[in-house]
């Protein structure tokens, strides 16, 4: 008989005969015939696939390497595969998560301007005027420059976006 | 796609003999795999028989082995049911179906394509 041009959805071609794929979390053992159905089977511990298939073979879990800074997220099932994602202070190199690199710290005068994730990386921002870090942070913000004026003191040396403002006393007016 | 139509019912004597047809309009008749199933009243529909695209193999439910002969004329775009020795628990109407995936004979759910089924009634 002349071949079915197509099959249905979740369907496969073979020999011209449609088959039945395999549901998500099986393999393909046997394709089927007219008369005896496509024949699937478990994928095993740490083993996955995550869609209607034809594969003869799972797919193996990713395996988070600790040495690569890496850990387990979400634990792989059959049906899905295992996601990393890196230890505290780092984070992913790619969106596969394959390595991580240390998270990056601002520098003086930079602030945190989003704090790193296990996925992105910190974006520093220059501490604006009126704003100072002096110090080389993966977390602290610019903190805005000391007001003398409350303090009831004036200002005796600047501040920079590296330093702090430095208060002093006013000075009392001569008689 | 196919459209079913099945014809050759009616009421019989027990012991006789009936012959249903089920002519398939559309293309590519010889691609599917077809089979005859029947619905007793209140009850649930049952497989009767099936046969291959090519007509070469055959399968029968063990309550009709032997009085029912299923065949099919793939240049005609019919397949045919052979009755004989019809009995009272015959009674039902009889569906035809056609399929293009692979399984089992008897998997209802298998089947793409229906007819509207004709009526077989056995008097005793």
């Known amino acids: 008989p002349e071949p079915p041009t197509a099959c249905r959805e979740k369907q496969y071609l073979i020999n011209s005969q449609c088959c039945s794929l395999c549901q998500p979390g099986q393999k393909l053992v046997s394709d089927c015939t007219e008369f005896t159905e496509t024949e699937c089977l478990p994928c095993g511990e740490s083993e996955f696939l995550d869609t209607w298939n034809r594969e003869t073979h799972c797919h193996q879990h990713k395996y988070c390497d600790p040495n690569l800074g890496l850990r387990v997220q979400q634990k792989g099932t059959s049906e899905t595969d295992t996601i990393c994602t890196c230890e505290e202070g780092w984070h992913c190199t790619s969106e596969a998560c394959e390595s991580c690199v240390l998270h990056r710290s601002c520098s003086p005068g930079f602030g945190v301007k989003q704090i790193a994730t296990g996925v992105s990386d910190t974006i520093c921002e220059p501490c604006p005027v009126g704003f100072f870090s002096n110090v080389s942070s993966a977390f602290e913000k610019c903190h805005p420059w000391t007001s003398c004026e409350t303090k009831d003191l004036v200002v005796q040396q600047a501040g920079t976006n590296k330093t702090d403002v430095v208060c002093g006393p006013q000075d009392r007016l001569r008689a | 796609q196919v459209q079913l139509v099945e014809s050759g019912g009616g009421l019989v004597q027990a012991g006789d003999s009936l012959r249903l047809s089920c002519t398939a309009s559309?293309?590519?008749?010889?691609?599917?795999?077809m089979a005859w199933f029947r619905q007793a009243p209140g009850k649930e529909r049952d497989f009767v028989a099936a046969?291959?695209?090519?007509?070469?193999?055959?399968h029968y439910a063990d309550s009709v082995k032997g009085r029912f002969t299923t065949t099919r004329d793939n240049a005609k775009n019919t397949m045919y049911l052979q009755m004989s020795s019809l009995k009272y628990d015959d009674t039902a109407v009889y569906y035809c179906?056609?399929?293009?995936?692979?399984?089992?004979?008897?998997?209802?759910?298998?089947?793409?394509?229906w007819g509207q089924g004709t009526q077989v009634t056995v008097s005793s």
């Open positions: 179906a056609a399929r293009r995936v692979g399984a089992v004979p008897e998997r209802e759910s298998a089947y793409e394509h």
């Open positions: 559309g293309r590519a008749f010889n691609t599917y795999t």
């Open positions: 046969i291959s695209r090519d007509g070469t193999i055959t």
